[in-house]
Interface confidence: low
């Protein structure tokens, strides 16, 4: 339904608070080094100027595309060019190629300061004092350092912020109320934000036939007493949201989410039974519980798949009359029947479905020819089950810390190219999936561990992108989305791999790693691990062990030494030759 | 092989109800998509009503909006068309058609099985 003023339409359908907020959110995600205040000097003007429109929508340039009038906006600032360099090229393009550049400019990993949490007092005093900027800034940093974070759902993130501070900054404890629910806030954020960069890798990288086959797999796992009708329109319309999220577009997105939250509740009779709860939530919680539901109890008698799928005479005729709508049907049966199948992994046997009928259907004897596709099935299910089942061991044998050390090593070892930090950050995510998932029983382990490696090993992908340096990362992360984790399974040692110098400066440790947190003391000990493997790639695990063990005696011992920058001299020369010793280096 | 079998069309005057059924056979009848369409002398068939596999979603042409009603009884394999309001222009022989996996409900062309029609005239 077109309107005469896109602008004052979305201002009427969202209000003033979310449109402001969605804008700035949109700002910062696009010029991600500019200072809070110009962002919000930029947003007051489009604010002000959207309220013209809602007055008149035939006012001067009301008419124009929200990218138009964004774009014009974001142009405006006078240290584009020395900010951010070529971006500032986008402002000669026209719409839509100058958004489509925009969106080419977004850096996963940009080289802003770490957040620090200041003092619980300073904060609850900051908050008091203006609480309106202090959720703005919340958006803004976060928007700034996640600029695929899925906007609707940062707004529902900045409400449990206010909640948290409206709650606590009067509780006789202010701290132990609130320093909880900020730490809980920040993880979730972290893995909400990484989830929807998988979204956005799937369908700019991938396209919109790869997004909706993975959204009718996980909505019929979902829901899977709702008819293939259903499912079909629900993912229709969850990819709307998502390209138009992905692409810059959150004020649509925002409206089309709620439109969508809106539907699933008015027709929650056909959709699943789960719904209940959430629907008689608020927008923003609604939104959000709708898109965590359980999965709703899969229908009694199921007739078996074969039928359809295998026996019938028409598979073909059905095949090549409507492709992709029958695979899409196929999808669906399957995933409805396995809750315990990865979302990743329904697609791989979908996919193998579908290279059997095109290369049968051609076959002289078609029914013969795909009559045993189901058994190629079996291996692409058993590995998955056979990597948790012996990685969950190995958790349960290790622990996080020294699980997450393990593969630290394995990745090292993989991809010794991938720089320290990115090593280690990823490592340190792919190791939490033993505490995320490996406490589940059996039937919920696959669904949870392999789609949350899917979210994790994507983090690797896109901040290989930005500095591509190991030609064996490109290929996992380029060549198919639903491979990329037994692609990386299946590397080896990198045998090309020339190790690096040996820089004595790298294991130089000082006093300062005794004030850390533990989280911050493990980084340390693991950016070192990654450091010698990256040295002496052949180094077994027992050597490595040694190493590691001689090095936390070592920040043990001096953390509690009386002179301690005096110990981590002297101590640590002698570490370093020992490992030196130990290592053959 | 789905068999579909249409019964109930007959004469009746403007503004008279006339009620069609579909009996199915041969097939797991609550998986198929179930379709009414029609063809009048000399034009080409077209939409008229359509229902999804249980009984959630139904679809109707423009035209017989608010006049026709498909439902169907899965536990009887049968499909019904009730038609108020009848008007000289409905004057076709109405087929029952079946679809097992389908994109648009409106498209004859996404159904795999079709009955042999039932005559329906409109006349005073």
């Known amino acids: 339904d077109a309107h005469k003023s896109e602008v004052a339409h979305r201002f009427k359908d969202l209000g003033e608070e979310n449109f402001k907020a969605l804008v700035l959110i949109a700002f910062a995600q696009y010029l991600q080094q500019c200072p809070f205040e110009d962002h919000v000097k930029l947003v007051n003007e489009v604010t002000e100027f959207a309220k013209t429109c809602v007055a008149d929508e035939s006012a001067e340039n009301c008419d124009k595309s929200l990218h138009t009038l964004f774009g014009d906006k974001l142009c405006t600032v006078a240290t584009l060019r020395e900010t951010y360099g070529e971006m500032a090229d986008c402002c000669a393009k026209q719409e839509p190629e100058r958004n489509e550049c925009f969106l080419q400019h977004k850096d996963d990993n940009p080289n802003l300061p770490r957040l620090v949490r200041p003092e619980v007092d300073v904060m609850c005093t900051a908050f008091h004092d203006n609480e309106e900027t202090f959720l703005k800034k919340y958006l803004y940093e976060i928007a700034r350092r996640h600029p695929y974070f899925y906007a609707p759902e940062l707004l529902f993130f900045a409400k449990r912020y206010k909640a948290a501070f409206t709650e606590c900054c009067q509780a006789a404890d202010k701290a132990a109320c609130l320093l909880p629910k900020l730490d809980e806030l920040r993880d979730e954020g972290k893995a909400s934000s990484a989830k929807q960069r998988l979204k956005c890798a799937s369908l700019q990288k991938f396209g919109e036939r790869a997004f909706k086959a993975w959204a009718v797999a996980r909505l019929s796992q979902r829901f899977p007493k709702a008819e293939f009708a259903e499912v079909s329109k629900l993912v229709t319309d969850l990819t709307k949201v998502h390209t138009e999220c992905c692409h810059g577009d959150l004020l649509e997105c925002a409206d089309d989410r709620a439109d969508l939250a809106k539907y699933i509740c008015e027709n929650q009779d056909s959709i699943s039974s789960k719904l209940k709860e959430c629907c008689e939530k608020p927008l923003l919680e609604k939104s959000h519980c709708i898109a965590e539901v359980e999965n709703d109890e899969m229908p009694a008698d199921l007739p078996s798949l074969a039928a359809d799928f295998v026996e019938s005479k028409d598979v073909c005729k059905n095949y090549a009359e409507a492709k992709d709508v029958f695979l899409g049907m196929f999808l669906y049966e399957y995933a409805r029947r396995h809750p315990d199948y990865s979302v990743v992994l329904l697609l791989r046997l979908a996919k193998t479905y579908e290279t059997t009928l095109e290369k049968c259907c051609a076959a002289a004897d078609p029914h013969e020819c795909y009559a045993k596709v189901f058994d190629e099935f079996k291996p692409l299910v058993e590995e998955p089950q056979n990597l948790i089942k012996q990685n969950c061991e190995l958790f349960e044998q290790l622990g996080e810390y020294k699980f997450q050390n393990a593969l630290l090593v394995r990745y090292t070892k993989k991809v010794p190219q991938v720089s320290t930090p990115t090593l280690v950050e990823v490592s340190r995510n792919l190791g939490k999936v033993g505490s995320k998932c490996c406490k589940h029983p059996e039937a919920k382990r696959m669904p949870c561990a392999e789609d949350y490696l899917s979210v994790v090993l994507n983090q690797l992908c896109v901040l290989h992108e930005k500095t591509p340096v190991s030609d064996r990362v490109t290929k996992c992360c380029t060549e198919s989305l639903v491979n990329r984790r037994p692609c990386f399974s299946a590397l080896e040692v990198d045998e090309t791999y020339v190790p690096k110098e040996f820089n004595a400066e790298t294991f130089t440790f000082h006093a300062d790693i005794c004030t850390l947190s533990e989280k911050e003391r493990q980084i340390k000990k693991q950016t070192a691990l990654v450091e010698l493997v990256k040295h002496k790639p052949k180094a077994t695990k027992e050597q490595l062990k040694a190493v590691m063990d001689d090095f936390a005696a070592f920040v043990e011992k001096c953390c509690k030494a009386d002179d301690k920058e005096t110990c981590f001299a002297e101590e640590g020369k002698k570490l370093v030759a020992a490992s030196q010793a130990a290592l053959g280096l | 092989e789905v068999q579909l079998v249409e019964s109930g069309g007959g004469v009746v005057q403007p503004g008279g109800s006339l009620r069609l059924s579909c009996a199915a056979s041969g097939g797991t009848f609550s998986t198929y998509v179930m379709g009414w369409f029609r063809q009048a002398p000399g034009k080409e068939r077209e939409f008229v009503a359509a229902i999804s596999q249980n009984s959630i979603h139904t679809y109707y042409a423009d035209s017989v909006k608010g006049r026709f009603t498909i439902s169907r009884d899965n536990s009887k394999n049968t499909v019904y068309l009730q038609m108020n309001s009848l008007r000289p222009e409905d004057t076709a022989l109405y087929y029952c058609?079946?679809?097992?996996?389908?994109?648009?409900?409106?498209?004859?062309?996404?159904?795999?099985?079709w009955g042999q029609g039932t005559l329906v005239t409109v006349s005073s």
């Open positions: 058609a079946a679809s097992r996996f389908t994109s648009w409900y409106t498209a004859d062309y996404e159904y795999d099985y």
